[in-house]
Interface confidence: medium
């Protein structure tokens, strides 16, 4: 089959925007299914129609509406006859037009003067591609040939910055790039003691505006008073915006405060956060945990548990605990040291054991009592020692 | 003169299959591609799909891609629309174009002009 | 997938210059194609390539398109030209066809 591009020379420049036909001939073939192939990708599409101009002679067109640059490339055209495939001979086709931007100026954050740079970089065709830049409404400087960069030594307020390209088919104007002033960055906010414990208090908080410079650290202050000593000053890098605060005495008041820091320094401190850590659970378990069979059920005693220290704060209720073997089980909060019990099964063993509460929580269990179904009083011992009469 | 004739079609159950024809004359059929397009009673236009004039490319839009079948037969000139399983929102009027080709003259495409009269497909249970 | 959106309807007095839209995002690489469908009847191409009118097709009828908008104008409406009138285009890929909604265009 006898196939060429026709009416196109080796070499085929459109301006962007405009319309473009290639027209492909194949003479010797009844029924060519002619493919159109772009940089080695055949250009499947229903753009493509045909002229039977007779029997053995068919023209194909490739209708390109309005070219840009991606249509840009070496096309031809292919049919397939007894199993081989045949090319045409390839036309390149190059899209002309205004300079197209590969690299655009960046939106920028800068300390106040501090020298930067900005970059722009635009192509062709046609070449050459010359850069003019623009600070606000002022051309600064002649044209450059692109990739041009623009040093700047800097500028004591926000700044707008373009830059324009030139070539034979026009000009082009970059995006507009606003160099930001760093600043200090703003106090933290909703700070919050999220869990405290006696001696760990856990603290998070929401950073203040940035002052367009990435926060590196924040800084939390805790005192016993507003203003008074401080007991401790931790500094976290961010994110995240949370700090464990470690080794506090038990029940005491606190005030913290938090700053964060940029590269420029840091942010004024956020008001004081007032508060206390929990005081200790009871030390010590009640001694002498002992029964009394009587008619009425079971009378259990106990002696009182005194502080051991200050932070223990009062002692509040007992609690008494008590499970039986056939599952049964139950607790009880008593204000003294004595305490009757009913709803157990006299026929099957009971283990009793009893602690002291405070704010805080209860303290260690006693050493579990046994009373058995046989005895008519229980003492104090290993869960499975019995006592008989 | 070019014309298309179109085969009728009775009523269908949902889920029956059916296939439905578009035989050419008066031109050279493996000169033109053949287009189908539906119109659904008192709606417009969608173009359905084509196939190339020898038959070797089909092309579908996206929502009658994998509901139906074209195909054709250079022998007798004849376009073929198959459905597997007819859904009762398949009820239209379904058209074959003549598509995608160019006068003898080089001068007007021939986009869509050869239509044929219509094949109204009712499914209903 | 890919959409051409025109309005409606359309009405004009006999003589009055007529304006239907068509706009698709590919309108700007692919052209744009326009039918003329009288009511019981099969479509009729009337403008191909945007704006090349096809033989037979009364002056009247014209077509352009600019940028993501193609626009059938006819220019001293007729009562005979009322009908459904589409737009059809190439999806951008150029791999499957498109109608418009169509708009029926009235003249009173």
């Known amino acids: 089959a006898g196939l060429k591009l026709m009416g196109a020379p080796v070499k085929l420049t459109v301006s962007q925007g405009q319309p473009v036909k290639l027209n492909c001939s194949v003479e010797g073939m009844e029924e060519p299914d002619i493919q159109w192939v772009k940089d080695g990708a055949v250009v499947q599409n229903l753009d493509q129609l045909y002229i039977p101009v007779s029997e053995q002679h068919w023209i194909g067109f490739l209708s390109l509406k309005s070219v840009e640059r991606s249509d840009a490339g070496r096309y031809w055209c292919q049919v397939e006859d007894g199993g081989e495939t045949e090319i045409s001979q390839p036309v390149w086709l190059t899209v002309e037009g205004v300079p197209f931007f590969t690299v655009e100026p960046k939106d920028l954050a800068v300390p106040p003067n501090a020298p930067f740079q900005l970059s722009c970089e635009a192509v062709g065709p046609p070449e050459p591609v010359t850069i003019v830049w623009w600070r606000g409404t002022t051309k600064i400087g002649g044209p450059a040939p692109s990739p041009s960069v623009l040093n700047v030594t800097g500028v004591t307020q926000s700044t707008m910055f373009s830059c324009e390209a030139h070539n034979l088919k026009g000009l082009a104007s970059s995006r507009t790039a606003t160099v930001h002033l760093q600043a200090l960055p703003a106090a933290p906010f909703n700070i919050t003691v999220t869990k405290l414990s006696s001696s760990n208090a856990s603290v998070a908080w929401m950073p203040g505006a940035d002052g367009r410079a990435l926060l590196q650290s924040c800084t939390v202050q805790v005192t016993q008073a507003p203003g008074g000593w401080e007991v401790l000053a931790v500094v976290v890098p961010v994110p995240p915006f949370t700090c464990l605060l470690r080794d506090l005495v038990p029940a005491t008041n606190y005030s913290l405060r938090v700053r964060c820091a940029n590269a420029l320094g840091p942010s004024p401190y956020a008001d004081w956060v007032p508060f206390q850590t929990k005081g200790l659970a009871p030390a010590s378990a009640p001694q002498n945990l002992h029964a009394i069979r009587t008619d009425s059920g079971l009378i259990l005693e106990w002696e009182e548990v005194i502080p051991e220290a200050p932070l223990e704060g009062p002692l509040g209720p007992y609690k008494l605990s008590w499970v039986q073997d056939n599952g049964t089980q139950d607790e009880l909060t008593v204000e003294g040291t004595r305490a009757n019990l009913t709803g157990w099964d006299p026929q099957k063993d009971l283990i009793v054991r009893v602690c002291v509460s405070n704010a805080v929580g209860c303290g260690p269990w006693s050493q579990p009592l046994v009373v058995s179904s046989h005895d008519r009083a229980g003492q104090q011992g290993p869960p499975h020692s019995r006592t008989s009469w | 003169e070019v014309q298309l004739v179109q085969s009728g079609a009775d009523v269908k159950k949902p889920g029956a299959s059916l296939t439905i024809s578009c035989q050419a004359s008066?031109?050279?059929?493996?000169?033109?591609?053949i287009s189908w397009v539906r119109q659904k009673p008192g709606k417009g236009l969608e173009w359905m799909g084509a196939i190339s004039r020898n038959g070797s490319t089909t092309y579908y839009g996206p929502s009658f891609q994998g509901h139906v079948t074209i195909s054709a037969d250079r022998s007798t000139a004849t376009a073929y629309l198959q459905w597997r399983s007819l859904e009762a929102s398949d009820t239209a009027m379904y058209y074959c174009?003549?598509?995608?080709?160019?006068?003898?003259?080089?001068?007007?495409?021939?986009?869509?002009?050869?239509w044929g009269p219509g094949t109204l497909v009712p499914v209903s249970s | 997938s890919y959409e051409l959106t025109q309005p409606p309807s359309v009405s004009v007095s006999p003589g009055q210059t007529a304006r239907i839209t068509c706009s698709g995002d590919a309108l700007p690489k692919k052209y744009a194609y326009w039918y003329q469908q009288k009511s019981g009847q099969a479509p009729v191409l009337v403008i191909y390539?945007?704006?090349k009118r096809v033989s037979g097709i009364p002056e009247r009828f014209s077509g352009s398109s600019s940028g993501t908008m193609a626009t059938l104008t006819i220019s001293g409406a007729q009562v005979e030209d009322e009908a459904d009138y589409y737009c059809?285009?190439?999806?951008?890929?150029?791999?499957?066809?498109?109608f418009g909604g169509g708009t029926k265009l009235t003249v009173l």
């Open positions: 390539e945007d704006k």
């Open positions: 059809y285009s190439l999806a951008v890929d150029g791999n499957y066809g498109v």
């Open positions: 008066g031109y050279t059929f493996t000169d033109y591609w």
């Open positions: 174009v003549r598509s995608g080709g160019l006068t003898s003259g080089g001068t007007i495409p021939e986009y869509y002009q050869h």
